[in-house]
């Protein structure tokens, strides 16, 4: 092809090529043609004769102002036609007359201000019609019943001011899953407007200034329709009362989106008419008081999003939002509750009472004063089968005994990014009989004891990153009870002292993060009593991160038990010479990181076993000694391996001898070196 299109598997991509005409030299069997972001003004039908197999044609982002009706005659199999972001202003009855197999027609962002006659009458198979971002002033798309298979009608960002039954009755035989009318200036819903549509399942009126009064009228118009999904995000619905959604009593609404409404007052029984509702979005509002009956009637809601729904009006404590006890008691089917990023004063004794199916609860950054978790804090969740609890970013400073004793089903507990500073007696976790993961990273300080985790032997993941960990060198190890542990993160703790039995018995451990500590002394031969072999017995370890520990020595047998090790990160240390056979048992190694060390020599006797099955190697920024003895084997291996070595050309540079300083390692000439073959 003389054009620069890329063709693969019957798909031709000719986008962003500044084309002024359709290429005439593409394979004739292409089924998908992308001509977006070019300079096409027209689409001569004749140019498509050779591409009769096309099922999808995308000519978006051009300057097409007119369509030849014959285009679809040449493309009898066309199913998807995308004309978005062009300059179409008129659609005649002939425009799409031959496009009878279309399932998708995208006309978004053109200049279509009015639809005359019936340009879509032949589109009996059309499923999606996108007319958003045009200048349409009404929903009138024709004068006779048509588009019986249409499922999505997208009319957002137009200038529609009223919905009228006489304009929508062309959809009398349609079942619309989605009627998208967001970002219009709708002021009127004429009687019967939605009943004119055969069946309407989804209505989206986001960014429409409805307010409480027009919302109420809308809901009355939706009475006795098939509506399932209703989205009224950012519709200036500042208050709701027991009449706002009254009309929805005669529907089976399952999804309601009231997000971004600056909703201030949620009156009692506002949602009493929605017993079928399952998904309720209330995020980004401004509810000042949730009354005990505000959510009454929502017996079937499974998902409720209250993120940033309760925010304080001023710095005054008196202006803090209030949630009455028992406010959630009606939500018997609720499984997922998101209450992130709120300004709720605290957890009251019956705040969550009645949530007998709750499995996921996010309380991240939810409270203004949740400094201490007591044995009463979560009492209202005692009858909830909670599996996941997120308590991050709440400035929690202390966890008292039995704080979670009510949560016997809990599997994941996230306490990260708080200010917890205490000795962990182990009582904090009492009752967590099914716990799988505890995330404690990014807290103030944690002092461990032999019993810190004695009561949670089921724990499989423990995250203790950057918690100023104290007493980790006690014996027995604080981790001794955790025989099911698969992931342990102890990184960023400046740990300098650990015993050889710290990880003893953790035979299921797969991931161990010890980066950013101060473990260098432990592997020195001069260490009193010799090197500390704290990795012994970890026969199922897959990932080991020891980056940034100041290591300048590695004992020869330190990795000998790690038969299943796949990834090891020893980057940002001070390693120079590694003992021969140090990696002999790492037959499964896939990724090795030794970047930013002081390695000068890469010899077969040290690295041969490690490199054998490697898929990724990172040894950037090491001061390589470019001599035959030091790197000849390495250079030959580099030039023959399929291992991915990022930035090989730019960051693997010789440091010595002086005449090679700054020279790329891979270009080192090994032809004069003897016995440097990488593979035998």
């Amino acid at each position: 092809s003389t054009t620069k299109c890329t063709v693969s598997h019957e798909v031709a991509d000719c986008s962003h090529l500044k084309l002024t005409q359709v290429p005439d030299d593409l394979p004739t069997n292409i089924t998908v043609l992308n001509l977006t972001h070019n300079q096409l003004r027209r689409l001569p039908a004749a140019n498509f004769t050779r591409y009769s197999q096309l099922t999808s044609l995308d000519v978006g982002f051009n300057t097409i102002s007119k369509l030849e009706p014959e285009l679809c005659q040449k493309l009898p199999m066309l199913k998807v036609l995308n004309l978005q972001h062009n300059e179409l202003s008129q659609l005649s009855d002939k425009t799409f007359a031959f496009c009878t197999n279309l399932t998708e027609l995208h006309l978004m962002s053109n200049s279509i201000q009015k639809i005359k006659n019936n340009p879509f009458v032949k589109q009996k198979n059309l499923i999606t019609l996108d007319l958003s971002h045009n200048g349409l002033s009404s929903t009138k798309l024709g004068t006779q019943v048509q588009l019986e298979n249409l499922q999505e009608l997208l009319l957002s960002n137009n200038k529609i001011q009223a919905l009228k039954s006489e304009e929508l009755d062309i959809f009398a035989n349609s079942s619309l899953k989605k009627l998208e009318l967001s970002s219009n200036q709708i002021k009127e819903f004429s009687p019967g407007c939605f009943h004119a549509i055969g069946r309407l399942f989804g209505l989206f009126l986001n960014n429409v200034q409805l307010g409480p009064s027009l919302t109420e009228k809308l809901c009355l118009e939706l009475a006795n329709t098939s509506i399932r999904n209703l989205s009224l995000s950012n519709s200036q619905l500042s208050t709701t009362s027991n009449t706002t959604f009254l009309g929805l009593k005669w529907t089976n609404l399952t999804m309601l989106d009231l997000s971004y409404n600056n909703l201030n007052v949620v009156g009692n029984d506002s949602f009493a008419w929605l017993p079928q509702l399952e998904y309720f979005f209330l995020e980004y509002n401004n509810i000042q008081h949730l009354f005990s009956h505000s959510l009454h009637g929502l017996f079937n809601v499974r998902y409720l999003n209250l993120k940033r729904s309760f925010t304080k009006q001023s710095i005054s404590l008196a202006s803090l939002p209030k949630i009455d006890d028992f406010s959630f008691q009606w939500l018997k089917c609720l499984e997922h509750l998101n209450m992130e990023d709120n300004d709720i004063p605290g957890i009251k004794s019956n705040m969550f009472t009645g949530l007998i199916n709750l499995k996921y609860l996010s309380l991240s950054n939810s409270f203004t004063s949740l400094r201490t978790l007591t044995n009463e804090t979560f009492v209202s969740l005692a009858h909830s089968p909670l599996h996941i609890l997120n308590l991050t970013k709440n400035k929690i400073s202390k966890i008292e005994s039995d704080a979670f004793s009510w949560l016997g089903h809990l599997e994941v507990l996230d306490l990260g990014l708080n200010e917890i500073g205490q000795e962990l007696t182990g009582q904090e976790w009492r009752g967590l009989e099914n716990i799988f993961e505890i995330y404690l990273s990014y807290n103030k300080y944690l002092q461990l004891t032999r019993n810190s985790f004695a009561l949670v032997p089921s724990l499989q993941r423990l995250m203790l990153r950057r918690v100023a960990l104290k007493n980790v060198d006690s014996s027995p190890s604080p981790f001794q009870p955790l025989r099911n542990l698969t992931i342990l993160d102890l990184s960023n703790n400046n740990i300098a002292n650990i015993n050889d039995d710290m990880l003893e018995g953790l035979e299921k451990l797969e991931i161990l993060d010890l980066q950013h500590n101060n473990l260098a002394r432990l592997w020195k031969h001069a260490n009193p009593g010799g090197p500390i072999y704290f990795l012994k017995g970890l026969s199922h370890l897959h990932i080991l991160n020891l980056e940034s520990n100041g290591f300048d020595e590695i004992p020869v047998e330190v990795f000998k038990d790690l038969f299943e090790l796949k990834i090891i990160d020893l980057g940002l240390n001070n390693l120079n010479t590694l003992p021969a056979s140090v990696f002999n048992n790492q037959v499964s190694l896939k990724s090795l990181n030794l970047q930013k060390n002081l390695i000068t020599s890469v010899e077969k006797k040290v690295f041969g076993p490690a490199f054998r099955n490697l898929t990724e190697l990172d040894m950037r920024f090491n001061p390589f000694d470019c001599t035959c003895e030091s790197i000849a084997w390495f250079v030959n291996w580099i030039n023959e391996t399929h291992t991915n070595i990022p930035e090989l050309s730019s960051h693997y540079l010789c440091n010595t001898p002086p005449h090679y300083h700054g020279f790329p390692v891979r270009l080192f000439d090994t032809s004069s070196c003897k016995d440097s073959a990488p593979f035998e």
């Epitope: 005994s401 009582q427 009492r430 032999r450 019993n451 004695a454 001794q480 025989r483 039995d501 003893e504």
Partner: antibody, heavy 119, light 107 residues
């Protein structure tokens, strides 16, 4: 099943030493710490110390620290408790015990070894 | 060291009686308390751990309660095989001390 079998009764003179053994079976010996507890006639049980069979690390009760030595032989799956400078008040039944999956309890005990100190 | 004090030291009761034995620690041991039953010439047998969790194979007539410093062992309806000596033991920090024992005898 987990079993701890101790050596037989001993009679010792004051000032002598005694070494009691505890052979473990039914589990991997190096996986769980072994504890030693004694009980003088009509007296309460007394915790003496614990050993990590894997590396030999020991924690002693300060009361016995100068006289007790706890060791292990991993090849024989056996722990030992040696008490020196015996006095008549050391006459007691000496037990070895092992923690369970829950490390805050002793579900497993040896049958006990009676050590009699008498001149 | 944490001292453990049991009361009463001895107790006479009849089959079918409800019996309560208490154990007090000289410091906070949280819930790291075990109860054992010992019969003459035998090793102690674990009944309850972590203050209230019943050990495997132990009849449900045994129950434990308490936290911090004060703990209770209750036998709801005494059976003939329950006449023995009962000990509490803490597991908070070494040394793991025992109570002096409570001897339960037939009235």
């Amino acid at each position: 099943q987990v079993q701890l079998v101790q050596s037989g009764a001993e009679v010792k003179k004051p000032g002598a030493s005694v070494k009691v053994s505890c052979k473990a079976s039914g589990y991997t010996f190096t996986t769980y710490w072994i504890h030693w507890v004694r009980q003088a006639p009509g007296q309460r049980l007394e915790w003496m110390g614990e050993i990590n069979p894997n590396n030999g690390r020991i924690n002693y009760n300060e009361k016995f620290k100068t006289r007790v030595t706890i060791t292990r032989d991993t090849s024989a799956s056996t722990a030992y408790m040696e008490l020196s400078s015996l006095r008549s008040e050391d006459t007691a039944v000496y037990y070895c015990a092992r923690v369970g999956v829950m490390i805050t309890t002793f579900p497993y005990w040896g049958q006990g070894t009676l050590v009699t100190v008498s001149s | 060291d944490i001292q453990m004090t049991q009361s009463p030291s001895s107790l006479s009761a009849s089959v079918g009686d409800r019996v309560t034995i208490t154990c007090r620690a000289s410091g906070n041991i949280h819930n790291y308390l075990a109860w054992y039953q010992q019969k003459p010439g035998k090793a102690p047998k674990l009944l309850i751990y972590n203050a209230k969790t019943l050990a495997d194979g132990v009849p449900s007539r045994f129950s434990g309660s308490g936290s911090g410093t004060d703990f209770t062992l209750t036998i709801s309806s005494l059976q003939p095989e329950d006449f023995a000596t009962y000990y509490c033991q803490h597991f908070w920090s070494t040394p793991f001390t025992f109570g002096q024992g409570t001897k339960l005898e037939i009235k």
